[in-house]
Amino acid sequence: DSSKWVFEHPETLYAWEGACVWIPCTYRALDGDLESFILFHNPEYNKNTSKFDGTRLYESTKDGKVPSEQKRVQFLGDKNKNCTLSIHPVHLNDSGQLGLRMESKTEKWMERIHLNVSERPFPPHIQLPPEIQESQEVTLTCLLNFSCYGYPIQLQWLLEGVPMRQAAVTSTSLTIKSVFTRSELKFSPQWSHHGKIVTCQLQDADGKFLSNDTVQLNVKHTPKLEIKVTPSDAIVREGDSVTMTCEVSSSNPEYTTVSWLKDGTSLKKQNTFTLNLREVTKDQSGKYCCQVSNDVGPGRSEEVFLQVQYAPEPSTVQILHSPAVEGSQVEFLCMSLANPLPTNYTWYHNGKEMQGRTEEKVHIPKILPWHAGTYSCVAENILGTGQRGPGAELDVQYPPKKVTTVIQNPMPIREGDTVTLSCNYNSSNPSVTRYEWKPHGAWEEPSLGVLKIQNVGWDNTTIACAACNSWCSWASPVALNVQYAPRDVRVRKIKPLSEIHSGNSVSLQCDFSSSHPKEVQFFWEKNGRLLGKESQLNFDSISPEDAGSYSCWVNNSIGQTASKAWTLEVLYAPRRLRVSMSPGDQVMEGKSATLTCESDANPPVSHYTWFDWNNQSLPYHSQKLRLEPVKVQHSGAYWCQGTNSVGKGRSPLSTLTVYYSPETIGRR
């Protein structure tokens, strides 16, 4: 109620002889400040005097003086809220009740605190979790209801008398609520800790033993097992017997069931601590263990690897990789179940033993077609030699080999013939599926690997074929050697280099571009008349009569070819000039007379000149000289001269006679 002073402090404090007591304490007076404080030991209220009797351990007065005998007890409080006390050292006879007599100006109060001082240091108390399981972390707590600033202590953990390696966390409390020292240890117990003694030891600052508490660990764990095997190395041969025994070295709580496992799978009807295997087979090789269960769970023994030894089984060959491409790498692996592992291998290629090959693997760095075939092997160990298995087939793939282009026709081939070629090869893997031909043409392929060229051209020189599977292999080109009549026959003038003038030396050449066979004959012809049989036609001194249309022929064993007609043109100065007169060389005066200068010239006459009997040139330059009307004075001899680019020619004299007309005669 509101008429009480309010105090807070631990209800009881514990200590031992020679230690100290620190009493945390707070208060709140009803009115004003504290004026008087007396600490009693076991105070008794005296009704007669209305005062408390008892040993006064501490007394403070208004002037604040403290008697010298009170040095052991110290009031560490103040006048309004702190009432903390210290007793150092504390003695056994300090046990009992401490009375704090507080007086303010108008109010009084007696506060009681219990003090329990033991003769020797009292033991700490170990607190354990309700259940401890192996490998599960637990916290062990050691609690001592003591702490005092003037008396340092330490708590140490021991397991079977040996300090524990794990780090403990120590904490102290000196508060109005509680006074204690506590050590906490985090610890993962193993099954082997079961039944072991854990000690919490109280020591002074120098590590001197003061007291301790001990507990026995009850670590729940699955059964711990040991497996024993006869024979001890667990290596036997087919037909031998094997005994395995399972021993429980520890179980908490007690075990309930037993079973045996092989390669992790439970063996049926095997629920005793002994496993008997009679006349073992190789299938019984494996990892064995026993399993025993309790309420915590199943425990398993270590595994025993039972090896049932046997001679190698029939072997198989694994090829990496088949089919293989020529030139690539290949590896063979001989696989055979055996125990112990095979120590020696014998390899066979197409049934023939490969000398010097005794390893499990055979490596070919560069495969060739001759490596193809069936590979088999035999494995051998200390117990015997296995059988040869069926073997594995190595397929070596390669491009077609020795490809040739073959001409099927009888030779020689003539232009226009139908030519048949075939593409042949020696071997191929995989099979040839198609063929290619060079050069490409609009040719027939009547069947695979056969080429038909209809109407073969003179210029079809070489043909090559390729046989193809996954790869193409080309043959060397084959020459068709097509025979044909001479081609592009033409007449060519060799000399002179310029135009042909009458009297020149002239050479004509019969040219052709090609001929197969090369041996040829030549023929020259003019107007259907044979002129010569050489490649050249020569004229020492050409005459205009040699002009005309010439052809040459070239022939070989295949046929003959004519050139186009070639016109030979001879240039010459005007010749055979003569003056012709029309209507005649006798003309009556008054009539018309026409003189014509006739000539033979190449090129034709370009310019004419007329002359009279006095060799006087007349002012006329055309081919015809027209006299109209003709006069008697015109009578006389005339001649003409013709000119072309080559030269000039003149005619002989031609006489014109002009006679008088009857009229003139009549007038005379």
Epitope: K352, M354, Q355, G356, P365, W370
Partner: nanobody, 122 residues
Framework: QVQLVESGGGLVQAGGSLRLSCAAS????????MGWFRQAPGQERRFVAG????????VYADSVKGRFTLSRDNAKNTVHLQMNSLKPEDTAVYYC???????????????WGQGTQVTVSS
């Protein structure tokens, strides 16, 4: 085309040495195996020694073990048969042959050299 050319044969005194060589060209070189055989007059061809081009050690007939040494020179596509402590019974025509593997039977060899005469006189 495969060609095998032997060389190094000749006449030697008993206890002497000879070195036979076999040069391979074409398919026989570089991959597969080379074998040496010998044929004494009136007898069958018998296996003497063999070696693979790519890997592995040589293989010898019991009659020549410890006396003959077979080696290969891959760079020159040549195998050499070093014959020491020669005996008169080693007299024969020596042939080199090519096959995919070292076989002991001459029937399993596809290509043969022309042979070289070795005569050991006592």
């Amino acid at each position: 085309q495969v060609q095998l050319v032997e060389s190094g044969g000749g006449l030697v005194q008993a206890g002497g040495s000879l070195r036979l060589s076999c040069a391979a060209s074409g398919r026989a070189s570089g991959s597969g195996a080379m074998g040496w055989f010998r044929q004494a007059p009136g007898q069958e061809r018998r296996f003497v020694a063999g070696i693979e081009w790519s890997s592995g050690g040589p293989v010898y007939a019991d009659s020549v073990k410890g006396r003959f040494t077979l080696s290969r020179d891959n760079a020159k596509n040549t195998v050499h048969l070093q014959m020491n402590s020669l005996k008169p019974e080693d007299t024969a025509v020596y042939y080199c042959a090519a096959a995919p593997w070292v076989f002991s039977s001459p029937d399993d060899y596809m290509y043969w050299g022309q042979g070289t005469q070795v005569t050991v006189s006592s």
